[in-house]
Interface confidence: medium
C-alpha cells in the first residue's frame, strides 16, 4: 500500500550489522508523486566500488546510487549525510554484507518522503501538446482557443471533422487556409452526392502547401482521398503532386487531412463537382453499340447487337441483341451478357458415315463428313464439307443444314466371280462375288438385296411364308455357319398385285409377275460380304438381247446335292423365250400348253447344262451395267423352269422398276 513517508534501518541498527546479509526494501508512494530518500547515518565497511558491503538504491533496473564507508553531515544544522530524489513513485533499497567484517560497523539509517513532481518540466518529453499545468500529485493539459483536447487528454487538435458536402459543386479548404493549418490534427470531410454521379476533385498546383515528406519519402502531414476501395494519395509537399482532376468513379468521397506536431505550411484548397457516372466504353469486336458515343454516362441506354455469327450467351436462347443501361455505380446493366461466337455443337452423326472432329464447334468452324467407303457413297451434301453457320447450324456449301446421306454402293462385288466354267453345271462361289445374295431358309430359296431395308425375291418364295427369315453375308448356309452370319427379319412382304394366288400352289402353271419385295425391320449394314445390287435403268440400254450374259448364284439343287450348303454360281446367256417353251416340263402339273410364257419373263441358260434349280428361286440374274462396267444390276429373278439343267425362266425386273420404286417410297422407313 503506498505511503507518504517511512524509515529504513539496516539490520540490528544501531548495533553492528551481521555478516552475510541481503535485505531489500520496496518503497512506494502514491501516483503523481516522486520520492525523496534521506540517509541520516552511514557506517558500512568500505571497499572499492563498495564490493564487500553496500546499500544500493534502484529505480526499476536503473541504479540511482551505491553507498559504503562512513559519512558525516556537512551542515551542522542538518543530520542528512546523503540524499536521492526520483520523479517516480517506486524505489528499491538493497543492503548486502559479505562473510567477514574486520571492524564493527553499525550500518545505516534513512527515511523517505513523497514529494510533488512537476510533470510539465521534469521530463524530457513534454506531456502536453500545448499547455501543461502542474498541481500537487499530478498535472493537466489545456488548449488555446478554437482547439479542443483529444480523448488522450494530452493532445490538442482543431475540430475540423464531421462536415458532409452534398451539393453537386463545392469548395473545401484546410483549417485557417491560407494561414498555416493547425498541427496535430486529423480533419475528415465527407462528400456524398446522389447515386449516379461521381465526385471529380480539382486541386490547382498553387493551392497546395503541406509539410513535405521525410528523407524516406513518408508524408509527415498528408491529404488522402478515399472512394470506396480506392485511395488517391497520400499527397504532401509544395504544389499539388497529383492530377489536376481526380475522377473518383464514386458518389462518395472521404477527404482525410492528417497533421503532426510541427510545421507552418498554409495548407490546401480544392474544388469538387459531380459528374454523371461514366460507364466504360468497351472495345467489342463482336458487337455494335447503338447509339455510338464518345462517352457513356449514368442513365444512358445502349442496344448491343451481336455481329453475324455471334449470339448472346445467357438469357434467351439464340438472342442476337440486348439492352444495357449505364447504372449509378458506373457499371453497365446486363454486363454478364456477351456476344460470343455461335456454337453449333458437336456435328450430328450420320448413319454409315462419320465426321472429322472439328477443331472447334464455334461459328466459322469446318468439318467434313465422309461415308464408309467403298460400301457407301454420299447421296447429297456435295463434297461433305460443312461449316458452322451464323444460325447455329452446320451447313453445306449450298448453305443447307440437311445432313449428308450415306447410301449403299450398289452392284459392286468386292471380288469378281471367275467361274471355272462358262446351280447346275456351275462353280463354287464366294459371297464376296455376290454380296447381294440373300438366303431364305423356309422355303430354301434366294433373294437379292437392293437397299438397306429391302430384299427383292420371287413371289412364289414368300407366298406361303409372309414372315420369312433371311441371312446375308455367308458363303455357307450350313446350320453351324448360319448361326454366325447376319440374320434379317422381315417387317412386311409386298407381293406384286399381278401375281395370282392359288388355292393349290403346287398346281401352278402361271408364274407371271413372279416378284415380291420384303421390307426389313432393321437396316442392313453393308460391307465386303453384304452389298445391294443395282436396279435396272429404264432406258433402252437395259433391254436384254439374246446372248447377253448374266450371273446366277444360289444354294439350290446341284448335280451332287439336293441343297448346296455352299454358294454356287454360273454364267448364263439370255435365250429366246421359245427355247424355254420348247423344253419338255419334267413331271408336269398340267398339260404342257397350260404353262404361261409372257414378256415379263427372261429365258436363259441352255449352255453346258448350266441352269438354276430348286432352292435358287428369287436369286438375282445379275448383268453387267452397260453404262458402268464395274457394276451389276438385277435383270432377272430366278422364277421357274421346265427342267433343271436346261433353260430357266427369270422374272424380267426392268418391267417392275416403277412398282419397286413406288412400293419402297410409299413404305420408306423414316
Amino acid at each position: 500500500e503506498p505511503t507518504m513517508y517511512g524509515e529504513i534501518l539496516s539490520p540490528n541498527y544501531p548495533q553492528a550489522y551481521p555478516s552475510e546479509v541481503e535485505k531489500s526494501w520496496d518503497i512506494e508512494v502514491p501516483e503523481g508523486y516522486g520520492i525523496h530518500l534521506y540517509f541520516t547515518h552511514l557506517d558500512i565497511e568500505l571497499s572499492e566500488n563498495c564490493a564487500y558491503d553496500s546499500v544500493q538504491i534502484m529505480s526499476g533496473d536503473t541504479e540511482e546510487g551505491r553507498l559504503c564507508g562512513q559519512r558525516t553531515s556537512n551542515n551542522p544544522h542538518s543530520p542528512i549525510v546523503e540524499e536521492f530524489q526520483v520523479p517516480y513513485n517506486k524505489l528499491q533499497v538493497i543492503f548486502k554484507s559479505d562473510f567477514s567484517n574486520e571492524e564493527r560497523f553499525t550500518g545505516f539509517a534513512a527515511y523517505y518522503v513523497a514529494t510533488d513532481i512537476n510533470e510539465c518540466t521534469d521530463f524530457v518529453d513534454a506531456p502536453c501538446s500545448h499547455f501543461c499545468n502542474n498541481f500537487i500529485g499530478g498535472y493537466f493539459c489545456s488548449c488555446p482557443p478554437e482547439y479542443f483536447l483529444h480523448d488522450d487528454m494530452k493532445n490538442c487538435g482543431v475540430n475540423c471533422s464531421g462536415d458532409v458536402f452534398t451539393a453537386l459543386i463545392g469548395e473545401i479548404a484546410s483549417p485557417n487556409y491560407p494561414k498555416p493549418y493547425p498541427e496535430n490534427s486529423r480533419c475528415e470531410y465527407q462528400i456524398r452526392l446522389e447515386k449516379g454521379f461521381q465526385v471529380v476533385v480539382t486541386v490547382r498546383r498553387e493551392d497546395f502547401d503541406v509539410e513535405p515528406a521525410d528523407s524516406e519519402g513518408n508524408c509527415l502531414d498528408s491529404l488522402v482521398f478515399v472512394a470506396g476501395d480506392q485511395q488517391f494519395g497520400p499527397y504532401c509537399g509544395r504544389g499539388f503532386p497529383g492530377p489536376l482532376n481526380i475522377e473518383t468513379k464514386s458518389n462518395a468521397l472521404d477527404i482525410i487531412f492528417q497533421t503532426d506536431l510541427t510545421g507552418q505550411n498554409k495548407g490546401w484548397k480544392l474544388r469538387y463537382h459531380g459528374d454523371p457516372m461514366p460507364c466504360p466504353k468497351e472495345e467489342t469486336p463482336t458487337s455494335v453499340w447503338e447509339p455510338a458515343k464518345a462517352k457513356y454516362v449514368f442513365k444512358d441506354v445502349v442496344r448491343i447487337t451481336c455481329l453475324d455469327g455471334f449470339e448472346v450467351v445467357e438469357g434467351r436462347v439464340g438472342a442476337t441483341s440486348f439492352h444495357s443501361t449505364c447504372q449509378s455505380n458506373g457499371k453497365w446493366s446486363n454486363s454478364k451478357l456477351k456476344c460470343q461466337p455461335v456454337d453449333c455443337g458437336i456435328p450430328e452423326s450420320i448413319e454409315n458415315g462419320k465426321f472429322e472432329d472439328p477443331e472447334s464447334t464455334l461459328f466459322g468452324s469446318v468439318t467434313r463428313y465422309t461415308c464408309e467407303e467403298p460400301y457407301y457413297y454420299m447421296e447429297n451434301g456435295g463434297n461433305g464439307q460443312y461449316h458452322c453457320a451464323s444460325n447455329g447450324s452446320w451447313v453445306n456449301e449450298a448453305l443447307s443444314p440437311e445432313l449428308p446421306k450415306c447410301v449403299p454402293v450398289c452392284g459392286v462385288p468386292r471380288e469378281p466371280f471367275e467361274g471355272k466354267q462358262r446351280i447346275i453345271g456351275g462353280s463354287d462361289a464366294d459371297i464376296k462375288n455376290f454380296p447381294w445374295q440373300v438366303f431364305f431358309d423356309n422355303p430354301w430359296a434366294g433373294g437379292a438385296l437392293i437397299d438397306e431395308y429391302w430384299v427383292l425375291t420371287a413371289a412364289h418364295v414368300v407366298e406361303g411364308n409372309q414372315e420369312p427369315t433371311m441371312y446375308v453375308g455367308s458363303t455357307s448356309v450350313q446350320t453351324s455357319r448360319l448361326a454366325k452370319s447376319k440374320m434379317l427379319t422381315s417387317e412386311r412382304v409386298f407381293i406384286h398385285p399381278g401375281w395370282k394366288l392359288l388355292e393349290v400352289p403346287e398346281a401352278r402353271t402361271n408364274f407371271d409377275n413372279d416378284i415380291a419385295l420384303v421390307q426389313l425391320k432393321d437396316p442392313v449394314k453393308m460391307g465386303p460380304t453384304v452389298a445391294p445390287i443395282c436396279l435396272p435403268g429404264t432406258s433402252s440400254d437395259y433391254n436384254l438381247m439374246d446372248g447377253d450374259l448374266g450371273l446366277i448364284a444360289g444354294w439350290g439343287r446341284t448335280e451332287k446335292r439336293d441343297r448346296a450348303l455352299r454358294l454356287k454360281a454360273a454364267m448364263l446367256p439370255v435365250a429366246p423365250l421359245r427355247k424355254c417353251r420348247e423344253v419338255k416340263v419334267e413331271n408336269p402339273k398340267a398339260d404342257a400348253g397350260a404353262y404361261v410364257f409372257t414378256p415379263n419373263m427372261i429365258c436363259a441358260g441352255g449352255e453346258k447344262g448350266m441352269d438354276s434349280c430348286k432352292g435358287d428361286s428369287g436369286g438375282a440374274f445379275a448383268v453387267q451395267d452397260p453404262n458402268d462396267k464395274t457394276k451389276f444390276y438385277v435383270a432377272g429373278l430366278v422364277s421357274w423352269g421346265p427342267q433343271c439343267g436346261t433353260y430357266g425362266l427369270y422374272t424380267r425386273v426392268q418391267n417392275y422398276v416403277d412398282w419397286i420404286k413406288k412400293t419402297m417410297q410409299e413404305n420408306s422407313t423414316p
Partner: antibody, heavy 119, light 111 residues
Amino acid sequence: QVQLVQSGAEVKKPGASVKLSCTASGFNIKDDYIHWVKEAPGQGLEWIGRIDPADGHTKYAPKFQVKVTITADTSTSTAYLELSSLRSEDTAVYYCARYGYGREVFDYWGQGTTVTVSS
Amino acid sequence: DIVMTQSPDSLAVSLGERATISCKSSQSVDYEGDSYLNWYQKKPGQPPKLLIYDASNLESGVPDRFSGSGSGTDFTLTISSLQAEDVAVYYCQQSNEDPWTFGQGTKVEIK
C-alpha cells in the same frame, strides 16, 4: 410341328409288290426332299433313295435302283415307296425321313413301316 | 460308294464311364473344310435319332455328354458318362457323296 406318319405294317408273299406311304405335316412337302431308309433284321441302316416332291426328281442307291420306285403327291403331302418282286431279304422296317435344313442329315423320321415277306 | 466301318461292333461300359466309338470312311468325307459325317442313335422299335451333325455339332436337345470329333476319314463319337438310357445301337453316316452310306452300327450295353 414337323411330323411324318407312315402307313401300317404289311405282310406279302414273295413276288408281290407293296406301296408304303409317308404323309407329311408341319412343313410344305414341295419345298423339301423325302428320303427312304431300310433296316433289315440284324442288319444296319441302308439308304434307299430320295424324291424332290416339287418336280418328282428322284435319286436311288445303285443297290435299290431296280427294286424300288419313289413317288410323291404334293396335293396330299404324301411320299410313296413301292417295292416290287418281293423276296424274303426285303423283309425289313422301312423309314421315311426329311432331308435337314442347312446340314446334310435326316432331321425328322417317320415311325417306320414293317414289311414281312413270307410264303 | 464310300464304305463306313465302325469299331467295335459292340461295347459294354459301366454306368458313368466313358464310351468311345470309332468310324472310318474308305475315302475323305470332307468338303471345303467341313466334314459331312453324322451320328444317329437307334433304339429298338424307334426310328433313328440324330445326335451329331457335321462331325462335331451337337443337335439341339441332345445331352452334352455326347460329343463328336474327327475329320477326313477318322471320326469318333464319345459318351462321356454313360447313362442307362444310352443303351442303343449307334450309327455313323456320311452325306458327302451319293449314295449316302451308314456304318454297320455299334451296340452299346451296360457292363
